[in-house]
């Protein structure tokens, strides 16, 4: 599928619905649909208590059926194991594609960990995390934050996708910020062009 | 019984774009997915790629990766395909077609020409 | 990807003759996403058959189809001046869909 590299931030504030859950076994077809869908066991939610409403929990998560229309496939057979998944919600069920930020919550560094439960949301709405694919790059608004992994690691698995999250300095200003023990660190030229 | 309305003919030059529309009507458009096929003069028929808009994910054909782009409105029903850096190649009848398991609902078809 | 090789490439028969096309698949597909199209000049497809053999909604009896894994079949038993068309299999079984390169029908 044809999946853009995506920032933890970004997913989060993209998303609908941010969860932990585990899977509970093999996807059902749902019968005269293009769906088919996991069961789910949500142990919390992290995005989406105000769209939810009073929905105490998600049973399932559906995707296409079909690989060829970006079906997510779940690989890991172990139901114990704990992931973060982020969707859409459309007539009060969540929707996953293969493109959609799911990994196991063990797999995320324990500052996007952090991040996940209390940090990304400051940054939704006012921040933009802004890849760069491509040098030369540079920002096209104060409020963006010029995402640099790909280029520096060849991956979006990078420092800044690990450890750093775009959020307001000021109320015209964004800049990457530490993730560690203190939230006030910034990311030294982080304004600068690539 | 679904109905699939496409935008008419298109003359483009090489290097533009073009974006086709394809309105659907009758059936729930956000739960079925909406491929997208061409065919050049005298040819066969070619997935470019689909998306199911509830979803809101397209998948391409490795062909088009790059060049073609598929979104869907879901408030006006409506799919789109936007093919890029358009050349004399790309002259064909592109089709919109309701996707279950198989293409069961076509549309019309739009002509795009690219010609200098 | 996996390709779908039909044949023959065109085949010439005279109304009233059976015809039988072949569809093979370059890696096994699962029947439920084999499809049969036709497509007549100046006009969009039109599905005949899903599921391998499944007929679609108001296609006639005539047509039907047949197969599994890698090798599937449409037969017309006798054939009607309207069924001179071309016809393509398809299958949307791995991360992409393809079509065969079509079969065209001509009046002998």
């Known amino acids: 599928c044809s999946c853009a590299p995506t920032h933890p931030q970004t997913a989060f504030c993209n998303s609908d619905l941010v969860i932990r859950a585990k899977f509970m076994g093999s996807p059902e077809i749902i019968e005269t649909t293009l769906y088919q869908r996991y069961e789910i066991k949500m142990t919390k939610m992290l995005k989406g208590f105000d769209a939810v409403g009073n929905a105490t929990g998600f049973r399932f998560a559906y995707t296409p059926a079909m690989e060829s229309l970006c079906g997510y496939v779940h690989k890991s057979q172990n139901r114990s194991e704990e992931f973060l998944i982020a969707g859409r919600l459309r007539n009060g069920n969540l929707h996953i594609t293969a493109c959609s930020f799911l990994v196991p919550w063990h797999n995320l560094s324990p500052a996007q960990q952090k991040a996940f439960v209390k940090t990304y949301s400051a940054g939704c709405g006012v921040c933009t995390v802004f890849p760069c694919s491509a040098i030369p790059c540079k920002l096209e608004s104060d409020s963006h934050c010029l995402w640099t992994d790909q280029i520096l690691m060849g991956s979006e698995k990078g420092y800044q996708s690990d450890h750093f999250a775009c959020l307001p300095r000021n109320p015209d200003l964004c800049t990457w910020q530490y993730l560690g023990v203190s939230m006030t660190r910034s990311l030294p030229l982080a304004k600068a062009e690539a | 019984q679904v109905q699939l309305v496409q935008s008419g003919a298109e003359v483009k030059k090489p290097g533009s774009s073009v974006k086709v529309s394809c309105k659907a009507s009758?059936?729930?458009?956000?739960?079925?997915?909406i491929s997208w096929v061409r065919q050049a003069p005298g040819q066969g028929l070619e997935w470019m790629g689909g998306?199911?808009?509830?979803?809101?994910?397209?998948n391409y054909a490795q062909k088009f990766q790059g060049r073609v782009t598929i979104t869907a409105d879901e408030s006006t029903s409506t799919a789109y395909m936007e093919l890029s850096s358009l050349r004399s190649e790309d002259t064909a009848v592109y089709y919109c077609?309701?996707?279950?398991?198989?293409?069961?609902?076509w549309g019309q078809g739009t002509l795009v020409t690219v010609s200098s | 990807d996996i390709v779908l090789t039909q044949s023959p490439a065109t085949l010439s028969l005279s109304p009233g003759e059976r015809a039988t096309l072949s569809c093979r698949a370059s890696?096994?597909?699962?029947?439920?996403?084999l499809a049969w199209y036709q497509q007549k000049p100046g006009q969009a497809p039109r599905l005949l058959i899903y599921?391998?053999?499944s007929r679609a909604t108001g296609v006639p009896a005539r047509f039907s189809g047949s197969g599994s894994g890698t090798d599937f079949t449409l037969t017309i038993s006798s054939l009607e001046p309207e069924d001179f068309a071309t016809y393509y299999c398809?299958?949307?079984?791995?991360?992409?869909?393809?079509f065969g390169q079509g079969t065209k029908v001509e009046i002998k």
């Open positions: 398809q299958q949307l079984y791995g991360t992409s869909v393809t």
């Open positions: 009758g059936g729930t458009f956000s739960s079925y997915a």
């Open positions: 890696q096994s597909v699962s029947s439920s996403y």
């Open positions: 077609a309701r996707t279950y398991y198989y293409f069961d609902s």
């Open positions: 599921g391998a053999s």
């Open positions: 998306i199911i808009p509830i979803f809101g994910t397209a």
